[in-house]
């Protein structure tokens, strides 16, 4: 099939003592092969500070798949989600507050 | 076909920079990371640093201060320079496509390396 | 940086032999563990990524086993091109590092 982007969106869970999960999740792309991963001022996280899900079908013929990542609370301008897909790329910051979410499709 | 292939100088003088060219084919630079690595005569290897695909760069923090990775997608082309060289420099030097799919990061696939020999 | 150590730095077998190269980090690193091979050419080859998973073209004679801080790779049936050296690599911790490397020869 044909290449489909990302439609990448970044979220924060609720503070627990003074830490804050980043969510950085990836939906409705095609081929499957995709990169994800948190960097803080520019520089990438070490596998180890990161975990991931699967990259599983989400029954449209596409794929979807997270990387999430724990920070302290007021640092989140400090972090970006890259992500890459089929010779694309993106960066996505940490929304401010958590009540809000960004959500980009890419072209 | 997935090709890199590394062109140096050979020879640098004590204190002087390298600056050495990773050619690549077969993939676009603008989705995949490339790594530079080393490998000092009988000895094993030591990554240097990696250049994104988005042109954001990671590096070794022992040679952070000496190092800088930079590319032009449209040439296909990454670049080493290294500042202050050393005889203990003296290496191959292979460039490497890295595959980063979530749990999984590898470099897959490998330029026959380029040897430099820092010498007065 | 995580220290990566190869106890056996050469060793020497038959034609058909089941060769186990050992690999062990100075910390856990999550099974986050590649295998290559380096030709006496220098001609560098990946083997096995994340402690278990053969690349495609890799023969299946070559196998990763291992968990926390201790990794193996297995060569089921030693085969004249297998002579080399061969380099475990973690990447659980930036800088990814490697072990000192391990040369088979044939006896």
């Known amino acids: 099939g044909s290449t489909v982007p990302p439609m990448v969106n970044v979220t924060c869970s609720e503070v627990s003592e003074g830490n804050i999960t980043v969510t950085c999740r990836a939906s409705s792309f095609y081929p499957r092969n995709i990169t994800l991963t948190w960097r803080q001022d520019g520089v990438s996280l070490s596998h180890n500070t990161q975990q991931w899900g699967d990259v599983l079908p989400d029954g449209n013929g596409t794929y979807q798949t997270w990387v999430a990542t724990r920070i302290r609370q007021g640092e989140e301008q400090r972090f970006t989600c890259y992500m890459e897909h089929s010779g694309n790329h993106g960066t996505h910051p940490v929304p401010s507050g958590n009540s809000h979410h960004h959500h980009h499709h890419h072209h | 076909q997935v090709q890199l292939k590394e062109s140096g100088p050979g020879l640098v003088a004590p204190s002087q920079s390298l600056s050495i060219t990773c050619t690549v084919s077969?993939?676009?630079?603008?989705?995949?990371?490339v790594n530079w690595v080393r490998q000092p005569p009988g000895k094993g290897l030591e990554w240097l640093g990696m250049?994104?695909?988005?042109?954001?760069?990671d590096y070794n923090s022992a040679l952070k201060s000496r190092l800088s990775i930079s590319k032009d997608n449209s040439k296909s082309q990454i670049f080493l320079k290294m500042n202050s060289l050393q005889t203990d420099d003296t290496a191959r030097y292979y460039c490497?496509?890295?595959?980063?799919?979530?749990?999984?990061?590898?470099?897959?696939?490998w330029g026959a390396g380029t040897t430099v020999t820092v010498s007065s | 940086d995580i220290q990566m150590t190869q106890t056996t730095s050469s060793l020497s077998a038959s034609l058909g032999d089941r060769v186990t190269i050992s690999c062990s980090a100075s910390?856990?690193?999550?099974?986050?563990l590649n295998w290559y091979q380096q030709k006496p050419d220098g001609t560098v080859k990946l083997l096995i990524y994340y402690t278990s998973s053969l690349p495609s073209g890799v023969p299946s004679r070559f196998s990763g086993s291992g968990s926390g801080t201790d990794y193996s790779l297995t060569i089921s049936n030693l085969e004249p091109e297998d002579i080399a050296t061969y380099y475990c690599q973690q990447y659980s911790k930036l800088p990814p590092t490697f072990g000192g490397g391990t040369k088979v020869e044939i006896k």
């Open positions: 910390q856990g690193i999550n099974n986050y």
């Open positions: 250049i994104w695909g988005d042109g954001n760069t």
């Open positions: 490497a496509r890295g595959a980063h799919y979530g749990k999984r990061w590898y470099f897959d696939v």
């Open positions: 077969g993939f676009a630079l603008t989705g995949s990371g």
